[in-house]
């Protein structure tokens, strides 16, 4: 399992280190989740050939995974702190149903999948404290999420494997873009 935030496994022991700022804590939290995703992807790629599949574009079209776009204000051109923060929080809330789907998809990394899910909830809380305009954040409808989850779980084995691969990859990309944007805030 990845080292919990605040105990960066790669860190050289730094004596008299100042307490982490809110931004650094968020940064560490995202890195912790990214480490977890890497471990899950390792199992997924070892178990199936999804990571090299050329058919992923077909499957991706059926998933409405959150993505960063220029209008979200998270890129350098047109960077807008508040718009971007709303997009990041909204995107993470939208990913939660997909992270729930991942919970029964791993054999040897079951704990890791749970850690990614729980750490994402903590990250959302951190970010909500940072946001000024909480009203602009739309929470996904629980009924819609429940039916999406049922639909995903009813897919055949190949599609389930592909869905798992795509969720992990898209979530990683979303977090990487979020990390870069949050550093500028």
């Amino acid at each position: 399992a990845p080292v919990p935030p605040g105990e960066d496994s790669k860190d050289v022991a730094a004596p008299h280190r100042q307490p982490l700022t809110s931004s650094e804590r968020i940064d560490k939290q995202i890195r912790y989740i990214l480490d977890g995703i890497s471990a899950l992807r390792k199992e997924t790629c070892n178990k199936s050939n999804m990571c090299e599949s050329s058919k992923e574009a077909l499957a991706e079209n059926n998933l409405n995974l959150p993505k960063m776009a220029e209008k979200d204000g998270c890129f350098q051109s047109g960077f807008n702190e508040e718009t971007c923060l709303v997009k990041i929080i909204t995107g993470l809330l939208e990913f939660e149903v997909y992270l729930e789907y991942l919970q029964n998809r791993f054999e040897s990394s079951e704990e890791q999948a749970r850690a990614v899910q729980m750490s994402t909830k903590v990250l959302i809380q951190f970010l909500q404290k940072k946001a000024k305009n909480l009203d602009a954040i739309t929470t996904p409808d629980p009924t819609t999420n429940a039916s999406l989850l049922t639909k995903l779980q009813a897919q055949n084995q190949w599609l389930q494997d592909m869905t798992t691969h795509l969720i992990l990859r898209s979530f990683k990309e979303f977090l990487q873009s979020s990390l870069r944007a949050l550093r500028q805030m």
Partner: antibody, heavy 116, light 107 residues
Amino acid sequence: QVQLQQWGAGLLKPSETLSLTCAVYGGSFREYYWSWIRQPPGKGLEWIGEIFHSGSTNYNPSLKSRVTISVDTSKNQFSLKLSSVTAADTAVYYCAREELDDFDIWGQGTMVTVSS
Amino acid sequence: DIQMTQSPSSLSASVGDRVTITCRASQGISSWLAWYQQKPEKAPKSLIYAASSLQSGVPSRFSGSGSGTDFTLTISSLQPEDFATYYCQQYKSYPRTFGQGTKVEIK
């Protein structure tokens, strides 16, 4: 082992367009940001800009009006175009992979000379 | 843009010496700083990221410290292969910016 291999014209005349390409071998292309950095002879490093596999870009404002960075995901390649070059654009141009923190893998560098 | 200022711009030292290079950012950058080593005619090589984390494969005689605006790269016992130019770089915001470099020469 990830490697970056770059190529392009090394000698240009003023007002021409510099064009370089960088190919990524042995690693995931879509999970990193890919940058161009230059170094004039005997001077320091200057970041030009970066691209993600999706095509989203960030450019150095000092060069933005002349720079285009593009990506070809089918070939795991990204390219730099710098228009209206002058002698001040003479430099070694590097492509590099930006991890979450730093430029951890670099191309071998291409010396570009602008001279009439 | 965030300006990065390194000092000294060059220094002379002997094998076995302890060497310290400083880097100052024009505004706070938290711990989002990297250090690179560059040898003549070669591409830069990443040494340290996040101000104090050692890149894998980099000898432990290299260490980094600092947060906010002031950062330090220390080589605890200079080796012959360490004579090179060192650059700091911030990645808090765009554009990414580098220090002007510190050349470590043989005394």
